[in-house]
Amino acid sequence: VPLSRTVRCTCISISNQPVNPRSLEKLEIIPASQFCPRVEIIATMKKKGEKRCLNPESKAIKNLLKAVSKERSKRSP
């Protein structure tokens, strides 16, 4: 990964665009730390493995997080 060894944060730009939970391969929530001062949300899409940074403050993204955690709680026994 070109910048990973030298940068603290992962996201260059962030997106407000809602993501269909069905098209998600993975959703990573990286908490703020000494390496990066802000929460970062990285969505990995099933199509082509595209990774997209999402805006943690966006209403649509907050709804997505709720939907994903609901889905997870349904699956876990």
Epitope: C9, C11, S13, E50, C53
Partner: antibody, heavy 124, light 109 residues
Framework: QVQLVESGGGVVQPGRSLRLSCTAS????????MHWVRQAPGKGLEWVAV????????YYADSVKGRFTISRDNSKNTLYLEMNSLRAEDTAIYYC?????????????????WGQGTTVTVSS | EIVLTQSPGTLSLSPGERATLSCRAS???????LAWYQQKPGQAPRLLIY???SRATGIPDRFSGSGSGTDFTLTISRLEPEDFAVYYC??????????FGPGTKVDIK
């Protein structure tokens, strides 16, 4: 509409300084990484610098490292390029460009919006 | 440092013909990091393709990108009069972080 407008170019002597500005409108500037790219007369494109949406990530081309500084003021929707110790080879059109939505260090969405450029001429 | 080479330097074609532009990297480049741009005289560049094969918003489907590793291709299936321009490939990688190829000029035969 989505727009980037550069300003601050002009004729300057070698060794002097200049500050370029790029004013954004029509989109939420504070959510996008921004670049400076230049093009010398009759030549191809040369990337100069990038800054992330929050200003945490800043990278420079080797040709300008230590002389140029990229910065942004999200409250003013403005990107800057501070250029010091200017050389004749810095003569070019300077474009500001927006990094694609959601771009990150793992996936590059390209530079999807460009300004029309501002001309910098370094000459004695 | 990864160097991008574009060929041919100039491509002379007629409207309606197919254009195939090549971009070769000196080392392997992830397709996640490869983009193509179009630039017309006196204008700013315009993003055509990102991720080696994904069309940017508003780009007609006659433009397509393909390739992986060190060899990438931009194809224009049927040239329209407005497609005559210079095309640049670009990669995002280690220092210098973003690199453009030297460009391919597509001109009218």
């Amino acid at each position: 509409q989505v727009q980037l407008v550069e300003s601050g170019g002009g004729v300057v002597q070698p060794g002097r300084s200049l500050r370029l500005s790029c004013t954004a409108s029509g989109f939420t500037f504070s959510q996008y990484g921004m670049h400076w790219v230049r093009q010398a007369p009759g030549k191809g494109l040369e990337w100069v610098a990038v800054i992330s949406y929050g200003g945490d990530i800043k990278y420079y081309a080797d040709s300008v490292k230590g002389r140029f500084t990229i910065s942004r003021d999200n409250s003013k929707n403005t990107l800057y390029l501070e250029m010091n110790s200017l050389r004749a080879e810095d003569t070019a059109i300077y474009y500001c460009a927006r990094e694609g939505e959601g771009s990150n260090i793992y996936y590059y969405y390209g530079m999807d919006v460009w300004g029309q450029g501002t001309t910098v001429t370094v000459s004695s | 440092e990864i160097v991008l080479t574009q060929s041919p330097g100039t491509l002379s074609l007629s409207p309606g013909e197919r254009a195939t532009l090549s971009c070769r990297a000196s080392q392997s480049v992830s397709s996640s990091y490869l983009a193509w741009y179009q630039q017309k005289p006196g204008q700013a560049p315009r993003l055509l393709i990102y991720g080696a094969s994904s069309r940017a918003t508003g780009i007609p489907d006659r433009f397509s990108g393909s390739g992986s590793g060190t060899d990438f291709t931009l194809t224009i299936s049927r040239l329209e009069p407005e497609d005559f321009a210079v095309y640049y490939c670009q990669q995002y990688g280690s220092s210098p972080i973003f690199t453009f190829g030297p460009g391919t000029k597509v001109d009218i035969k």
